[in-house]
Interface confidence: medium
């Protein structure tokens, strides 16, 4: 049986339930990997309270419609004269980015995730060359998600003291250049989410291959590399690469513009305030 | 104030049965999650049952399909039904309570099996 959503394929997804301090390991083409889940779980359930682990959702035992993904295990359930077995049920909707799964609510015998994502979309109007994970969720189960800075069309101008070049990015996505003809940008390779600008010529300095990463408190980074093997020849025989660094500010003010702190052989380091990079709870307070 | 009561604890025999029950007071039982754990003599405290929020239960192997975990909103109580009791299920149980405000341990009551 094909992939339903081959765009959501690559990467195992997380979902949490906040209020029984449970974290979900989802990977809807094939296992995630996870040896206590056993070999073929689709769905893994980690109890971080009581550190153990349960499939609620087998890959092989998957079905599918166009909006529907149901994994099905072999675990009974404790449902009254009964025969139902332990599943998981995953509604998609459309959506302007890969999105993220959203943990519902469960039953004894059914958990319940909801996944607004490009990849359920009818028409590919919003659907990227390239797109990765955007979100991450640290210890304590706090959500950081910066699937608001994804653009859907056109970029972000890097904050550069170089007057000759420019240095365009998007997050967690290659750049839509079709749907925004600016100039600068129109030159831009396909597949690109680092478009650096040297008067009329456009290079790809880097796409985005891993999901966003956590790595300390309230600072998430984006690594994004030039997958294509040809060398820049400005870049003295090194292969470019774009590391962005999210901060959540340390008090609430307004967000800065992405600015780059470290340039060399066309390695960029960038470094980007935003409360986007603050956990959920904080941003809804 | 959170307080967490367990009661029916006892002695009994290899193969016997015992219902633990935990009545709370200051929380709203069916909005959250329950854990019932144990410690033997001389041993780490270890999990034994869990009854999520919407209803969903996992048990420890050392328990499955001889203990079952129940909840009665309406008498704001948790219950622990103990089957096929063996000796080395001797051990202080504790009903535990997590909530986002924070989580509450009962003073734990003593389950002995012996002949």
């Known amino acids: 049986q094909a992939a339903p959503f081959p765009e959501l394929c690559s990467y195992t997804w997380e979902a949490v339930d906040t209020k029984n301090n449970v974290l979900y390991k989802i990977n809807i083409c094939g296992s995630v990997d996870i040896v206590q889940c056993g070999p073929s779980s689709a769905v893994c359930m980690h109890d971080l309270k009581t550190r153990t682990y349960h499939s609620v959702g087998d890959s092989v035992l998957r079905s599918a419609t166009r909006s529907l993904l149901e994994f099905n295990t072999t675990v009974s359930c404790d449902q009254q004269g009964t025969n139902h077995r332990v599943q998981s049920s995953i509604a998609f909707l459309c959506g302007k980015t890969l999105g993220t799964p959203e943990f519902v609510t469960a039953t004894e015998c059914v958990h319940y995730f909801e996944w607004r994502t490009t990849a359920a979309c009818k028409k590919d109007i919003f659907k990227a060359n390239k797109e990765v994970p955007c979100y991450v969720f640290d210890e304590e189960l706090r959500k950081h998600d910066l699937n608001p800075l994804i653009k859907l069309s056109g970029a972000y101008l890097v904050d550069d003291s170089d007057p000759d070049t420019s240095l365009f990015i998007n997050v967690c996505r290659d750049i839509d250049t079709l749907r925004d003809p600016g100039s600068q940008l129109r030159a831009c390779p396909p597949g690109t989410a680092a478009c650096l600008v040297r008067g009329h010529q456009a290079f790809d300095v880097g796409q985005p291959r891993d999901g966003l990463k956590l790595v300390r408190k309230d600072r998430l980074v984006l690594s994004y590399v030039r997958e294509e093997a040809g060398k820049l020849d400005f870049c003295d025989g090194h292969s470019p690469a774009v590391t962005i660094t999210f901060v959540c500010p340390s008090e609430r003010r307004e967000g800065t513009i992405p600015k780059l702190t470290a340039k060399s052989n066309c390695r960029y380091e960038i470094e980007w305030i935003t409360e986007y990079a603050c956990h959920r709870d904080y941003l809804e307070s | 104030q959170v307080q967490l009561q367990e009661s029916g604890g006892g002695l009994v025999q290899p193969g016997g049965s015992l219902r633990l029950s935990c009545a709370a007071s200051g929380i709203i039982f069916s909005d959250n999650r329950m854990d019932w754990y144990r410690q033997a003599p001389g041993k780490q405290r270890e999990w034994v049952a869990t009854?999520?929020?919407?209803?969903?239960?996992?048990?420890?192997?050392s328990v499955k399909d001889r203990f079952t975990i129940s909840r009665d909103n309406a008498k704001n109580t948790v219950n622990l039904y103990m089957n096929s009791l063996q000796p080395e299920d001797t051990a202080v149980v504790h009903h535990h309570y997590y909530c986002n405000s924070g989580q509450y341990w009962g003073q734990g009551t003593q389950v002995t099996v012996s002949s």
């Open positions: 009854l999520a929020s919407y209803g969903w239960k996992t048990y420890a192997d």
